[in-house]
Amino acid sequence: EEELQVIQPDKSVLVAAGETATLRCTATSLIPVGPIQWFRGAGPGRELIYNQKEGHFPRVTTVSDLTKRNNMDFSIRIGNITPADAGTYYCVKFRKGSPDDVEFKSGAGTELSVRAKPSAPVVSGPAARATPQHTVSFTCESHGFSPRDITLKWFKNGNELSDFQTNVDPVGESVSYSIHSTAKVVLTREDVHSQVICEVAHVTLQGDPLRGTANLSETIRVPPTLEVTQQPVRAENQVNVTCQVRKFYPQRLQLTWLENGNVSRTETASTVTENKDGTYNWMSWLLVNVSAHRDDVKLTCQVEHDGQPAVSKSHDLKVSAHPKEQGSNTAAENTGSNERNIY
């Protein structure tokens, strides 16, 4: 009778993570009698996957009933496959021995490759906000995918970006891989509503790439422009001065009126109007009682935006003669203002 051979017909098996892998193995003879064992890897460090004789292997089931006397099919199924299961599996026939069974013949091995989906890309921007015309970096990370081949693209508002660097780690063989990419984006004043998108394409995604997004509203700071104007007389001896705070983002803003350098009033932007580009406008006005002043008055509108150093705009109020009417006041212009008379 010909000597027993252990046949593993599949050189390689490809399985998606979470699925069940079937590793096929048959023997050409029943003798010599003895158990089979499955190992991952070869040599002294090999890992026992299944032992027909003893042990508890909850993820492993046999394809056929190995307790049947004439069984020569030693195929196994491994459930809930993860990338960590990748490797070469050997079906090994032992003959009975004492005190231990003796390895008799090994199959040629089956390489198990695991296809694992990348995790949802996570895009993160800079820790601090930046202003238009500045270049900021965004990072995109995705983990746990296999095989190593992967494609990553960056977009800003649907337009593909070209200034980015991508690394896939580790460089050598691994059960699973991670991708890390850094893109550089130049901010413009119109970017409050903009989005940066990181798109990852992988064989496991069947043409439906994963996307991670970052809103530039979390990154950008658009500093305000200030304009201080003197409005028409409201009543005898009273002048209305407005400070128009335009095109700022985010909303966090504090305004202080100074009268000849002295703090007159401080207020926080509350009822703002939003522009189409996502920036905000706000107006504050100050009612000045001219009769309380003998000399000209220097009114300053000082704005502290989003914790940045204050910017200011001044207006010289002449008190030598009564001002003439300059246009009209509308309710809209006064929205969000607080009337404070200065005496």
Partner: antibody
Framework: QVQLVQSGAEVKKPGASVKVSCKAS????????ISWVRQAPGQGLEWMGW????????NYAQKLQGRVTMTTDTSTSTAYMELRSLRSDDTAVYYC?????????????WGRGTLVTVSS | DIQMTQSPSSVSASVGDRVTITCRAS??????LAWYQQKPGKAPKLLIY???NLQSGVPSRFSGSGSGTDFTLTISSLQPEDFATYYC?????????FGGGTKVEIK
């Protein structure tokens, strides 16, 4: 025909030795192990030991250690069991049995038995 | 060593009866248990291997069950040729051990 044929009955004096043979036919002798089991008159079955017909490894029951030797001759497909320093309580029918389990031990083929009587 | 305890040691039954013999191992032996039938002056004959597998040529009225430490041999309808002594045997590890036997006698 698959069978195990054992040597004939033996009468031995205490202190003597006995060697029982078991010739296999009809199957590949080297593919299986052989166990020896004995049964004293009116008693149950007692396993004595096992030998691999392929590699010659042995495993003996503790109580017989030092007195029993099991061997095989693959050229004649024969297994042997020698028991030394015989005592009267060694009187029994001695069976050879083919061990056929793949990852366990059971005996699917038995010899007819050899009666060994130890008497002064 | 693994001790095998068989019960009952004897049972009286009639043809057609259902007979159950139990065997308990002193420690877990997975499914590595065999049952044998022995008639006077004859060698034992394998009936069941690996706890529940019927040996080739054995009538289907014989069945085995159990795993771990508790095992059962059942003869569903006793026939005249079934009157004999039955032994269980653990095949999990050396030394191999047998139960004390159960004698099935005619009532």
């Amino acid at each position: 025909q698959v069978q195990l044929v054992q040597s004939g009955a033996e009468v031995k004096k205490p202190g003597a030795s006995v060697k029982v043979s078991c010739k296999a036919s009809g199957y590949t002798f080297g593919g299986y192990g052989i166990s020896w089991v004995r049964q004293a008159p009116g008693q149950g079955l007692e396993w004595m030991g096992w030998i691999s017909a392929y590699g010659g490894e042995t495993n003996y029951a503790q109580k017989l250690q030092g007195r029993v030797t099991m061997t095989t001759d693959t050229s004649t497909s024969t297994a042997y069991m020698e028991l030394r320093s015989l005592r009267s309580d060694d009187t029994a029918v001695y069976y050879c049995a083919r061990e056929a389990g793949s990852s366990w031990y059971d005996f699917d083929l038995w010899g007819r038995g050899t009666l060994v009587t130890v008497s002064s | 060593d693994i001790q095998m305890t068989q019960s009952p040691s004897s049972v009286s039954a009639s043809v057609g009866d259902r007979v159950t013999i139990t065997c308990r191992a002193s420690q877990g032996i997975s499914s590595w248990l065999a049952w044998y039938q022995q008639k006077p002056g004859k060698a034992p004959k394998l009936l069941i291997y690996a706890a529940s597998n019927l040996q080739s040529g054995v009538p289907s009225r014989f069945s085995g069950s159990g795993s771990g430490t508790d095992f059962t041999l059942t003869i569903s309808s006793l026939q005249p040729e079934d009157f004999a002594t039955y032994y269980c045997q653990q095949g999990a590890s050396f030394p191999i051990t047998f139960g004390g036997g159960t004698k099935v006698e005619i009532k």
